[in-house]
């Protein structure tokens, strides 16, 4: 079956800036600002667009070692990001996949609203544990607040962007600011 859970949360960060940091550069930021939640993000294949596969590794103490995500859509204009958890943990046993949609909407006060949809595609008659839904929501909140805190502390980061290619970033092209580049050289 398919079980859909929707949630909304707010941020004081403007939508465009939050999209750049939280979505487009989350692979870099999450292990740095929330190492208790994500230890590393590795690009397995693709360049960040649809079809890209990422391996998200979890720190010691969490029940599963990693999951793999597949990017399904990146809409830079409407600040939309769709991806699916396709491997690792319970995927392949009780769950076929978890499809996620994130849309960041600008608010009149200069902040933003994140609209999040999580669709759990279960195998057979398996149901989704309430604890799983809660954990997913809490993890999203943890990552968001960690990124938000980082952006508030680094007011120049993820504003005026340049597309650069750096060996220090694994040779991949990344959206990054001059001030952020300094941090990455020492990361």
């Amino acid at each position: 079956g398919v079980f859909n859970y929707e949630t909304e949360t707010t941020s004081v960060i403007p939508a465009a800036r939050l999209f750049k940091a939280f979505i487009l550069d989350g692979d870099n930021l999450f292990p740095k600002v929330a190492p208790q939640a994500i230890s590393s993000v590795e690009n397995i294949e693709g360049n960040g667009g649809p079809g890209t596969i990422k391996k998200i590794s979890f720190p010691e103490g969490l029940p599963f070692k990693y999951v793999k995500d597949r990017v399904d859509e990146v809409d830079h204009t409407n600040f939309k990001y769709n991806y699916a958890v396709i491997e690792g943990g319970p995927i392949g046993d009780t769950l076929e996949k978890i499809s996620n949609e994130i849309k960041i909407v600008a608010t009149p006060d200069g902040g933003s609203i994140l609209k999040i949809s999580n669709k759990y595609h279960t195998k057979g008659d398996h149901e989704v544990k309430a604890e799983q839904v809660k954990a997913s929501k809490e993890m999203g909140e943890t990552l968001l607040r960690a990124v938000e805190s980082y952006l508030l502390a680094h007011s120049d980061a993820y504003n005026e962007q340049k597309l650069i290619s750096e060996e220090d970033l694994g040779g991949e092209q990344k959206l990054i600011s001059e001030e952020d580049l300094h941090h990455h050289h020492h990361h």
Epitope: L62, P63, D93, K129, A135, M139
Partner: antibody, heavy 123, light 108 residues
């Protein structure tokens, strides 16, 4: 059906080596950590550590570090626990169990469990 | 390491009784607490995960509660097959994962 099946009981002499096995079926073996748990006669459960079948990553409990060795053969969905030189104090029931839990949280538990392998070390 | 202390270590009860077993952690473990049942000569079996969630296939007479440092396992109406040893286990701070010392439930 998700299950773990362990090798049979062993009787050994002090100083001998031993390798016992735990075979998983009914689930994606490489997605889950396998834990080993010791239960000495008439005593409680002691967590020995974990091994991840995907890449053989190992976490030993400090109490068992250097005393035992974990290994895995993911091609046959089997984990192993071994001793290079057994002692009388290694006499116990040894269980393997799958670490399950809630993704993105610290909620972790053990289910299912193997039937246990009784190891007796006596001269 | 987080220490888990169960009480009582053993108790006697009769069929139909309501029984409560407690587990105390040496520091807060949120709700990351599980309960297992072990019958003589058998492997442990998961009863309750995440402090209060009943594992699939476990009778509803078993329930769990608590958060932080204090947790309870309750059997609302004891059945003959419930006489066993019960263990709590924390997964908040690992390694190592730690179990309580066990509570032996005997027939009065």
């Amino acid at each position: 059906e998700v299950q773990l099946v362990q090798s049979g009981a062993e009787v050994k002499k002090p100083g001998e080596s031993l390798k016992i096995s735990c075979s998983g079926s009914g689930y994606r073996f490489t997605n889950y950590w396998i834990a080993w748990v010791r239960q000495m006669p008439g005593k409680g459960l002691e967590w020995m550590g974990l091994i991840h079948p995907d890449d053989s990553d190992i976490r030993y409990s400090p109490s068992f570090q250097g005393q035992v060795t974990f290994s895995v053969d993911k091609s046959i969905n089997t984990a192993y626990l071994q001793w290079s030189s057994l002692k009388a104090s290694d006499t116990a029931m040894y269980y393997c169990t799958r670490q399950d839990g809630i993704l993105w949280s610290h909620n972790a538990w053990f289910d299912p469990w193997g039937q246990g392998t009784l190891v007796t070390v006596s001269s | 390491d987080i220490q888990m202390t169960q009480s009582p270590s053993s108790l006697s009860a009769s069929v139909g009784d309501r029984v409560t077993i407690t587990c105390r952690a040496s520091q807060s473990i949120s709700s990351y607490l599980n309960w297992y049942q072990q019958k003589p000569g058998k492997a442990p079996k998961l009863l309750i995960y995440a402090a209060s969630s009943l594992q699939s296939g476990v009778p509803s007479r078993f329930s769990g509660s608590g958060s932080g440092t204090d947790f309870t396992l309750t059997i609302s109406s004891l059945q003959p097959e419930d006489f066993a040893t019960y263990y709590c286990q924390q997964s908040y701070s690992t390694p190592p994962i730690t179990f309580g010392q066990g509570t032996r439930l005997e027939i009065k």
